[in-house]
């Protein structure tokens, strides 16, 4: 072992102050002992040690913790954190919100980093599930955070936490993972009445189904085309026209904009010209008058 | 015990010099950054200048910035402030303090009167 | 003008408490450690609070710091007479290179 340097005579630390923002890196290695750093985490975050300084402090961190830092350490590390693998992270033992929330808060206004990404995933598995004010903390952080979850994942989330989503929240958000967000949403707000039912529901329906769609056109709820847009393709197909018309009530005109798109684009063909034409939008390609339409999915079905 | 002790302030006309030197005691001088603080009579502290232990970086006030020169003697266990081209707004109780962060210890501070 | 914002003024009764407010900037307050200094009339001032929040020895646990932000605050609970003095809060201020400090506050026990 390479004999380390000693510590200049009255230079030993006896507080992390900020006369250490003066020491060379050989200085804090040889005169600030692992110990008293760790007590006092909480002041390192005050001081502006640079990114060189820093390094030393972690390594004196590493030394004294080789099998992960503990969480009175963990809470305060502060701007040290940034220097955290994510090798370093999955020592920890992370089980407080708030260690959590000041971790995060070193991190606030960047992209999620694969820290923080192993953070999150450390302390979510250490709670079994993701419960509401986790939620609430990891969508304050990162509005996307859950949307970058698999459908395996999100189906540990309780629905008494979707009462934490935002709309923006799911903007990121697949197919696959609103059809594992909407049941637990549907289940959240069922209490609810009809119009504050519909403002808490909108941003889940694109995993909702056909028959909760129909439901929904009998509530004059006047969805807007962005939401509509964001259907299921397969749960759109087999809206009547007049469901439709219901479904979007003054929003339906917007149905011509779109009509070369997804869902809508589909949703035309499904439909025959003449309900097209009471709408009084000009959309063309529906079925013809006098062919007859098969169900070829009921007829698969049925072999 | 940590004491700091100016001297050096008095009644000077404006466009003089004076030097002001802070005696330090009670602790490692030569580890820590010094500062001057200054405050005008009836009014609110104005920080003035730091410098580092090992005197490489030295931070002054924009309202002072080429006029007063900070400097140490760690040998001394002291620290000056040559103040040139004085005007009276520069009237106040000097102060000489630990650290550049957050001041720990103060001296009780000298007088400088700039006036014709 | 001070770069950082105090109120000129708080008061209260013996026991009560009052709490000063210092704001600042995303230069200053925002990523450095705020201090608080008291100074009692006719004397030096006197390190209250750094760190944001850390007491030096010798200072009662009646006044407490804490920061968010870019603004900072000290509250006094318990109130006393010997309290009645000035306080100011402090900060490096990263684009001036240089430390500022609040206009000060005068705290009066009434």
């Known amino acids: 072992e390479v004999e380390k340097t000693a510590c200049p005579s009255g230079k030993k630390a006896r507080e992390i102050d900020e006369s250490l923002i003066f020491y060379k890196k050989w200085e804090l290695e040889a005169c600030v002992d692992a110990a008293l750093l760790a007590t006092q985490m909480d002041r390192v975050n005050a001081i502006p040690f640079t990114y060189e300084q820093l390094d030393v402090l972690k390594h004196k961190l590493d030394e004294l913790y080789p099998q992960g830092y503990p969480e009175s350490v963990i809470q305060h590390l502060g701007y040290l954190f940034l220097k955290m693998s994510p090798e370093d992270i999955r020592k920890w033992n992370v089980t407080s919100l708030e260690t959590l929330k000041a971790l995060l808060e070193v991190n606030k206004g960047h992209e999620m980093s694969p820290q923080v990404a192993t953070l999150i995933d450390r302390f979510v598995k250490g709670r079994g599930q993701l419960d509401k004010d986790t939620l609430d903390t990891l969508t304050a952080f990162y509005p996307g955070y859950l949307c970058s979850l698999s459908p395996e994942e999100l189906s540990s989330v309780p629905p008494s936490s979707i009462w934490a989503v935002r709309p923006q929240d799911l903007d990121t958000c697949d197919p696959r993972q609103l059809d594992v967000l909407y049941p637990k949403a549907r289940l959240a707000f069922q209490n609810m009445n009809g119009s504050e039912y519909f403002v808490k529901i909108q941003s889940f329906l694109g995993g909702a189904p056909t028959e909760d769609l129909k439901a929904l056109s009998q509530q004059n709820v006047s969805m807007d085309l962005a939401t509509f847009m964001k259907l299921r393709t397969d749960a759109v197909l087999p809206l009547t026209v007049a469901e439709v018309q219901k479904l979007l009530g003054p929003h339906v005109e917007g149905l011509k904009a779109e009509e070369r798109h997804r869902p809508v684009r589909d949703w035309i063909l499904r439909q025959r010209q003449d309900d097209l034409d009471t709408l009084g939008l000009g959309l063309q390609g529906g079925i013809p008058n006098g062919y007859l339409v098969l169900d070829l999915s009921m007829q698969e079905a049925l072999s | 015990e940590v004491q700091l002790l100016e001297s050096g302030g008095g009644l000077v006309q404006p466009g003089g010099s004076l030097r002001l030197s802070c005696a330090a005691s009670g602790f490692t001088f030569s580890n820590y950054a010094m500062s001057w603080v200054r405050q005008a009579p009836g009014k609110g502290l104005e920080w003035v200048s730091g410098i580092p232990p090992d005197s490489g970086s030295k931070y002054y006030a924009d309202s002072v910035r080429g006029r007063f020169t900070v400097s140490r003697d760690n040998s001394k266990n002291t620290l000056y402030l040559q103040m040139n081209s004085l005007r009276a707004e520069d009237t106040a109780v000097y102060y000489c303090?630990?650290?550049?962060?957050?001041?720990?210890?103060w001296g009780q501070g000298t007088l400088v009167t700039v006036s014709s | 003008q001070s770069v950082l914002t105090q109120p000129p003024s708080a008061s209260g009764t013996p026991g009560q408490r009052v709490t000063i407010s210092c704001t600042g900037s995303?230069?200053?307050?925002?990523?450095?450690?705020v201090s608080w200094y008291q100074q009692l009339p006719g004397t030096a001032p006197k390190l209250l609070i750094y760190y944001n929040s850390k007491r030096p020895s010798g200072v009662p646990d009646r006044f407490s710091g804490s920061k968010s932000g870019t603004s900072a605050s000290l509250a006094i609970s318990g109130l006393r007479s010997e309290d009645e003095a000035d306080y100011y809060c402090g900060s490096w201020d990263s684009s001036l290179s240089g430390y500022v400090f609040g206009g000060g506050t005068k705290v009066t026990v009434l």
């Open positions: 303090a630990k650290n550049m962060l957050s001041f720990d210890y």
């Open positions: 995303s230069s200053n307050i925002g990523p450095n450690a």
